[in-house]
């Protein structure tokens, strides 16, 4: 079955880091990019960045540059998104989404991971 | 960054009626070389991830009912639901992928 399964909800303290995983199954990950998109409560979707799953090249949105790191482990068919220096405004649902080379849209999403930042 | 502006913010439509959602981008999303507009539409229901409906402004994703259609080019785009069904109640987002990615603010569609 073609799917993306994300790690479970996290509660973090301000200043800490969080690492969310996204495991792919049912397709060859090297043919795709994995994007990370977040959605704060009641807010619009916000693009964070992506990784080319074949060669690990990454591009990040300027807003997150220096605070987000997207990696991948091809042997585990898994992509990761780590966000550091967490603040309360980072409380959101974080999604991974698949984008096939040269098409520029998300045809498959993970179920989402709620990250709560609270002291 | 390219700014995506959706209107209206919310829309109440009777079952079987037409729903029209607009999306305006701050710059053209048309790549003249490929002839494609890099705009997609997604549907999101509470507690679920978004679901792809339309890509390249007007191409329907497989499995999406034909009551959903996309149109427009350049900076002005429209998502139309020709005959609203109960299961279409959701928030709809446009998204540009011409330069990186940005989403519109969403349009909530509910039943009148």
């Amino acid at each position: 079955q073609v799917q993306l399964v994300q790690s479970g909800a996290e509660v973090k303290k301000p200043g800490a880091s969080v690492k969310v995983s996204c495991k792919a199954s049912g397709f060859n990950i090297k043919d795709y990019y994995m994007h990370w998109v977040r959605q704060a409560p009641g807010q619009r979707l916000e693009w964070m960045g992506w990784i080319d799953l074949e060669n690990a090249n990454t591009i990040y949105d300027a807003k997150f540059q220096g605070r987000v790191t997207i990696t991948r482990d091809t042997s585990a068919s898994t992509a990761y998104m780590e966000l550091s220096s967490l603040r309360s405004e980072d409380t959101a649902v974080y999604y991974c989404a698949r984008d096939v080379y040269g098409r520029y849209f998300y045809d498959l999403w993970g179920q989402g991971t709620l990250v709560t930042v609270s002291s | 960054d390219i700014v995506m502006t959706q209107s209206p913010d919310s829309l109440a439509v009777s079952l079987g009626e037409r729903a029209t959602i607009n999306c305006k981008s701050s710059q053209s999303l048309l790549n003249a070389r490929t002839g494609k507009n890099y705009l997609a539409w997604y549907q999101q229901k509470p507690g679920q991830p978004p679901k792809l409906l339309i890509y390249w402004a007007s191409t329907r994703e497989s499995g999406v009912p034909d009551r959903f259609s996309g149109s427009g080019s350049g900076t002005d785009f429209t998502l139309t639901i020709s005959s609203l069904q109960a299961e279409d109640v959701a928030v709809y987002y446009c998204k540009q992928s011409y330069s990186r990615r940005t989403f519109g603010g969403g349009t909530k569609v509910e039943i009148k």
Epitope: G102 | L29, R33
Partner: antibody, heavy 127, light 107 residues
Amino acid sequence: QVQLVQSGAEVKKPGSSVKVSCKASGGTFSSYAISWVRQAPGQGLEWMGGIIPIFGTANYAQKFQGRVTITADESTSTAYMELSSLRSEDTAVYYCARGAPNYYGSGGYDDGWFDPWGQGTLVTVSS
Amino acid sequence: EIVMTQSPGTLSLSPGERATLSCRASQSVSSSYLAWYQQKPGQAPRLLIYGASSRATGIPDRFSGSGSGTDFTLTISRLEPEDFAVYYCQQFGRYPTFGGGTKVEIK
């Protein structure tokens, strides 16, 4: 209409480097891609790598990784291809062309096919 | 890397005849990412077809492209004297590769 004009022929010694330029006119140079393709005498075409100037970083074919450097100067609308550690098998006509693989995940920045092409630059490697 | 194999290596035909050139990919290629080029001696290649079947600007309609998956075809419906040249197919995905070329010569 985009036009690409390349620098002139070069004769180089084995072990040295060569830098070929490709000046573009027409269109918005920063947002379109430039590839470099070579053709040895009587042989086929071989993609070496490409760059989208607005992003700055280049991508290379595995065969040339570590030996080729592709750069772009937006101020002069010029792309460059430098090949180092030259050997006799590098004797070829080197072409620049508009278009390159879009590694940058953004639909607005060109798309793959190569058109137009520069006129070609013959690089001869001989001792 | 995707290997593109063209056949035949050489095609000997008379003006007015139909030319059919084949290109096979070692793995499936999106039709969006398949192009054909024409090259004459001492000249740079010239784009004929992109997206497997879309004619480039200024290309006569006697040139047509078709195919999908791993098998693609360039057809010249009626050869003109200026069509005798070498033709290359190319896939332009992540790592572009060209076929070895088909030489179309006068019989």
